[in-house]
Structure formats: structure tokens, C-alpha cells
Interface confidence: low
């Protein structure tokens, strides 16, 4: 339905507070280097303008598109050229090219300082002094560091952030109350950002069809009692929501997400029996809850898939009449029967089925040709099952830190050209699959593990795309969305890699390592491990283990010494020499 003024429509739908929050997120995700105060000023100007349009939709400029209004506002930033370089050229373009240009300049790894958490009393004072500014600052800092963060979900995080401070700043032990909550929000926030980044990559790099296929599979697993028409409607609406958010249309996205939650709750009887609790919650909690809701029970006595998709004489006729609908129905029927499969596995099966029909429906005897198509699925199913079994056994044997180290070595040998910080970050996250998924029973391991790995490998892909250094990474990232993980798994040691020159400075440590948190100390050691492998890619596990054990002992010894700095200097030289000898450097 057309509105005279889009900005007035969204302001009225969303209300002033969410309007302002979403505009702030949008601006911070586009201009990631701009100071907070500049963004607040821009947001206030846009909000005042929106209010004039609410009062009179025919007022000057109120009929302009949101992209035009927001783009014009962003292009008033005086320091655009100095701060952003060629991004300033976007301002010479007309819509919709200008918005596309801004989107292309979003930076997944912006050069921003690490967020340091102040003392609890300092935070509580800031919260009480100016709650509104404090919460806006949270939105701004998260949005600029995570330019694809799902905006309506960030409002939910901000609400929980506010609740944590409201509760804990009046608690007897503020720190004991607040810090675990902030840790939880940080970890959940990083996971939420990474999951959304995969959705946006799916839409932007592989297109709407790829995203819709993913959504059909996931929603069919989650809502196995819903009929195909219902799932299709939800997929269409969900695709619109994510297309908007990934495209920077945050007001439309938030509004449409609210509409979708409303629709789901009004029609929960025909969707899922698990939605009742979610639908009793306020909007932000409701939308989050629906997105995370557990799979409904599978309907009893579902007929065999073979009848409709293999044995029927009408397979090719049905396929030819409406290919995507027929494949969608196949995916729906397969996914609702298999909550134990990962979404990417289901998509591989659907792709295999599609390829088989393309070939067989042109053959002399189509039925004879596709009769054994389900047999082709067996190795595709067994491959992730075996991989997960092996890796969970390794995780249980080693524990998370050493399991991460094993993956660090494995991935550095596969793609040694990738920067050390990226290899450390990605391998650490890959290693978290153990504690996240291996505790689950067999039936839940694969969807947990392989779909999580898809999210983590997408982080590698988007970071690598910014500075491409490895053809192998480019190949695995771009050839097939659903085969990324098998592609990386299949990579062997890169024999073409010329080992890095040895640099003693890389392995020089100082007393500051002693004051680091356990996590930061691990990262330091893991960084050294990656550098070791880059210097000596043919080093055996045993050699690397020996060097790392010596290194751990060295850090422990010097951190206990009276003169720590001298210990690090003297013992460090010995360690470097011993390591070089052990690795034959």
C-alpha cells in the first residue's frame, strides 16, 4: 500500500524511540568511523524532519524515499573524503546506485579500538547520569563494529543491556550481578552478528533463491506440522525482512519483522505448537523467541518420500511444470522428516536431486534414470556424520583449548597465506563447535555443528574478501554456499607455500603477558603457534606440541619470577634457540 510519505509512515508505525534507534544503527553501520556526537546530531535532524512529515505528509521533501533522505543526510558529513576516501564518491551518484555504493563500502573488520569495559561503578554512574545517551552509545558502538548486525535484534539486545544496568546498579554487589550479564550479551551478540552476516552473504553473493532454499529447509525443520503453502508464505515474508535489513533498509525491516511476528502468532495453530510462550511476550522478545523456537514434533505416520519423488510416473511432469515449486516441496518434505540433518546437508541433497532430474528428465527412460537417486544421498549424509564423530572424539580427548590448537595447525597448513589474526579468530571459533555441539545427542549434533561451522567459515570468507590472499579460500568461498565446509575440509597442506622467514621478534614476549586474562593469554600463545606453522609448515604434531609445551612452561616460570622482564628476555632467547633446533629452522 502506497504512502504519501514513507518517512512519516515508518515513524508512525515504529514510534519515535525505535525510529531514532534504527536510524542511528543505520548511520553507524554506513559511516563506521564517525564520532558518536556527529551521528546523534544527524539522527536528531532526521527525526525532526520526520515529525514535520507526520504533521503534514505533503510538506516539502516528505515524499522522498528513505534512501534519498538518509543518503542526502550522510553526504552532508564534512569530513567524508578525509575519513572514508573513495566512499565519498558515492555521494556523486543517484539513488539507487548511491545506496549500493554505501553498502559496498561497509567494512567487516573496521580499524576501530577494542571496546574496553570500564569499572562497574563508572558504568553505573554513566547509566544513571544519562540513560538515553548511555544506551544510544551501546547501539552505536555495536552497529559500527558489526555493520550487518540484524537491527531489530540489536534493539532487543539494547533492551536487555538496559535491564541489566537497571537491575544491577542497585544491587549490593554490582559487579557480581552485572559482569556475567554483560559477558552473556557480548557472546550472544557476537554469535547473532555472525549468523546474520551469513544471511546477508547468502542473499548478496548467492541471491534470493539461495536464501529462500535455506529458509524453506530451516522453517520446515522447525515447523514440520505446517503445510507447504504456510511455509512458503513465511519464507517469502522472511526473505523480504532479511533482504531489507541486509540492504540497509532498517525501518522497513523492523516494521516487516513485527508484522511477521504478528502473523505467526495469529496463525500459530497452523504453524507450530511451540509458539504459545513466545507469542505472549512483548514484541522484541516475541520476535527473538520465535527466531530461536525449538522444532515442533514431527507429524506421526508421514508417508515415504519415495512415492512422490521417485516412484511416481509424474516426477518429470511435475518438475517441468514448476521447477522451483517442486524442488521446494522436495526440500520441505525432506527437511520436516529430518530435524537431525544440518540445513546445508538438506540443501546438498536437494541440489543432488535437482541435478539428477535435470539429467534424467531429458533421458530416454527418465524413471529408470532417477530410480536410484536416493542411493546417491547416502555418502552425502555419511560424510558430515563421520567428520563430526571424529572431531567430537578429538574434542573430548583434548578439551577446548588444545582442540582449537589442533584446528589452528590444520587450517594454517591448508591456507597459510591468510593473516595470523584471522586464522586465530576463525580457528578459535571453529574450535568452539566442540563445547557447543558435542554435548548433544546424535540426533542434534549435525544441525548444531555443521550449521555453526557454516557461520564461522563465512566469517573467514568475508574477512578474506576484503584482502584476498589465497586462491584456495576464494575458491571454497565462492563456488558453492552449501559446500563451503566440505571444500575446506577437503583441502590438504598447501605444497606451493613458501615458508615465512624466521623472525625472532615474533617470538619475543614481555611481562605484560602475565597480567592478561586467560583468554588473552591463550590468544598470544595461539598467535605464536600459527607463526610457528607458517615458518615450518612441515612440522609434525609432536614437534609443535613439544615447542608449545616449552612455551607454556616458559610463560609460567617467568610470570612467577621476581624480575619478570629479565626472565622473559633471557629465558626467551633460550626458548627461541631451542625451538629453532627442535624444528630444524
Amino acid at each position: 500500500d502506497a504512502h504519501k510519505s514513507e518517512v512519516a509512515h515508518r515513524f508512525k508505525d515504529l514510534g519515535e524511540e525505535n525510529f531514532k534507534a534504527l536510524v542511528l544503527i543505520a548511520f553507524a553501520q554506513y559511516l563506521q568511523q564517525c564520532p558518536f556526537e556527529d551521528h546523534v546530531k544527524l539522527v536528531n535532524e532526521v527525526t525532526e524532519f520526520a515529525k514535520t512529515c507526520v504533521a503534514d505528509e505533503s510538506a516539502e521533501n516528505c515524499d522522498k524515499s528513505l534512501h534519498t533522505l538518509f543518503g542526502d543526510k550522510l553526504c552532508t558529513v564534512a569530513t567524508l573524503r578525509e575519513t572514508y576516501g573513495e566512499m565519498a564518491d558515492c555521494c556523486a551518484k543517484q539513488e539507487p546506485e548511491r545506496n549500493e555504493c554505501f553498502l559496498q563500502h561497509k567494512d567487516d573488520n573496521p580499524n576501530l579500538p577494542r571496546l574496553v569495559r570500564p569499572e562497574v561503578d563508572v558504568m553505573c554512574t554513566a547509566f544513571h547520569d544519562n540513560e538515553e545517551t548511555f544506551l544510544k552509545k551501546y547501539l552505536y558502538e555495536i552497529a559500527r563494529r558489526h555493520p550487518y548486525f540484524y537491527a531489530p535484534e540489536l534493539l532487543f539486545f539494547a533492551k536487555r543491556y538496559k535491564a541489566a544496568f537497571t537491575e544491577c546498579c542497585q544491587a549490593a554487589d554490582k559487579a557480581a550481578c552485572l559482569l556475567p550479564k554483560l559477558d552473556e550479551l557480548r557472546d550472544e551478540g557476537k554469535a547473532s552478528s555472525a549468523k546474520q552476516r551469513l544471511k546477508c552473504a547468502s542473499l548478496q553473493k548467492f541471491g534470493e533463491r539461495a536464501f529462500k532454499a535455506w529458509a524453506v529447509a530451516r522453517l520446515s525443520q522447525r515447523f514440520p506440522k505446517a503445510e507447504f503453502a504456510e511455509v512458503s508464505k513465511l519464507v517469502t515474508d522472511l526473505t523480504k525482512v532479511h533482504t531489507e535489513c541486509c540492504h540497509g533498509d532498517l525501518l522497513e525491516c523492523a516494521d516487516d519483522r513485527a508484522d511477521l511476528a504478528k502473523y505467526i502468532c495469529e496463525n500459530q495453530d497452523s504453524i507450530s505448537s511451540k509458539l504459545k510462550e513466545c507469542c505472549e511476550k512483548p514484541l522484541l522478545e516475541k520476535s527473538h523467541c520465535i527466531a530461536e523456537v525449538e522444532n515442533d514434533e514431527m507429524p506421526a505416520d508421514l508417508p515415504s518420500l519415495a512415492a512422490d519423488f521417485v516412484e511416481s510416473k509424474d516426477v518429470c511432469k511435475n518438475y517441468a511444470e514448476a521447477k522451483d515449486v517442486f524442488l521446494g516441496m522436495f526440500l520441505y518434505e525432506y527437511a520436516r522428516r529430518h530435524p537431525d540433518y544440518s540445513v546445508v546437508l538438506l540443501l546438498r541433497l536437494a541440489k543432488t536431486y535437482e541435478t539428477t532430474l535435470e539429467k534424467c528428465c531429458a533421458a530416454a527412460d527418465p524413471h529408470e534414470c532417477y530410480a536410484k537417486v536416493f542411493d546417491e544421498f547416502k555418502p552425502l549424509v555419511e560424510e558430515p556424520q563421520n567428520l563430526i564423530k571424529q572431531n567430537c572424539e578429538l574434542f573430548e580427548q583434548l578439551g577446548e583449548y588444545k582442540f582449537q590448537n589442533a584446528l589452528l595447525v590444520r587450517y594454517t597448513k591448508k591456507v597459510p597465506q591468510v593473516s595470523t589474526p584471522t586464522l586465530v579468530e576463525v580457528s578459535r571459533n571453529l574450535g568452539k563447535v566442540g563445547s557447543k555441539c558435542c554435548k548433544h545427542p546424535e540426533a542434534k549434533r549435525m544441525p548444531c555443528a555443521e550449521d555453526y561451522l557454516s557461520v564461522v567459515l563465512n566469517q573467514l570468507c568475508v574477512l578474506h574478501e576484503k584482502t584476498p590472499v589465497s586462491d584456495r579460500v576464494t575458491k571454497c568461498c565462492t563456488e558453492s554456499l552449501v559446500n563451503r565446509r566440505p571444500c575446506f575440509s577437503a583441502l590438504e597442506v598447501d605444497e606451493t607455500y613458501v615458508p615465512k622467514e624466521f623472525n625472532a621478534e615474533t617470538f619475543t614476549f614481555h611481562a605484560d603477558i602475565c597480567t592478561l586474562s586467560e583468554k588473552e593469554r591463550q590468544i598470544k600463545k595461539q598467535t605464536a603457534l600459527v607463526e610457528l606453522v607458517k615458518h615450518k609448515p612441515k612440522a609434525t604434531k609432536e614437534q609443535l606440541k613439544a615447542v608449545m609445551d616449552d612455551f607454556a612452561a616458559f610463560v609460567e616460570k617467568c610470570c612467577k619470577a621476581d624480575d619478570k622482564e629479565t626472565c622473559f628476555a633471557e629465558e626467551g632467547k633460550k626458548l627461541v634457540a631451542a625451538s629453532q633446533a627442535a624444528l630444524g629452522l
Partner: nanobody, 122 residues
Amino acid sequence: EVQLVESGGGLVKPGGSLRLSCAASGFTFSNYNMNWVRQAPGKGLEWVSSISSAGTHIYYADSVKGRFTISRDNAKNSLYLQMNSLRAEDTAVYYCARDPHSTGWYKDFDYWGQGTLVTVSS
């Protein structure tokens, strides 16, 4: 000064209907989400229904879904609750309340009316 004044309560038989009104003043009504909340005798507060600033988003508690209808007239600065098929358990003081956040359904309302009593009894 923000003011919310409810009216329309009274005694009604089970199965009967009532229409509550809430007249708002002292703020830009059309910019705020509005809510109905009730309190049964001796019980805690129970959220009943929410309506977004433009009236496009509407939510109901399960206990009233299909029987109550929330609406608003921004030109008249008024909020309404049409209550049909009333039951004894709907007996309560009904309050209209403003959402300070103008959105988000936080349910921590900043302004409340004085309430209007609805009694459902034969």
C-alpha cells in the same frame, strides 16, 4: 501535563458487551503506543492489549484474544477497548497506559489513567 482518563466501565451480565474509552491529553498521542492493563480484585496487574502509534500493530493477551478489540482514533486523542462475550474472570479495574518508549512493547508504562471498574456478574 499528561492525562489519561478512562470511562465506560460498569456492571454487565456474562456474555454481555462493554466499550471502554480513554481520553488522552498533554502529549502527542499519535506518536505513542498505547495499552490496556487490568487488575482483578486481590490479583496483580495483567497486560490486556497493545496498539502501535499508527494502529498498524495490535497485540492481545491469550485470555482475551477473539473477544476484545483494541482501537484508537488519533484525531480524537482516544483509545478504545471493545469487550464482547464477557466472563466473570474479566472483572477488574481497567487502566489505559502509555508506553514511554513509543515502541518496543517494553511494558514498563510511564503514565496510567485512574482506571474504570468492570464487573461481570449475573
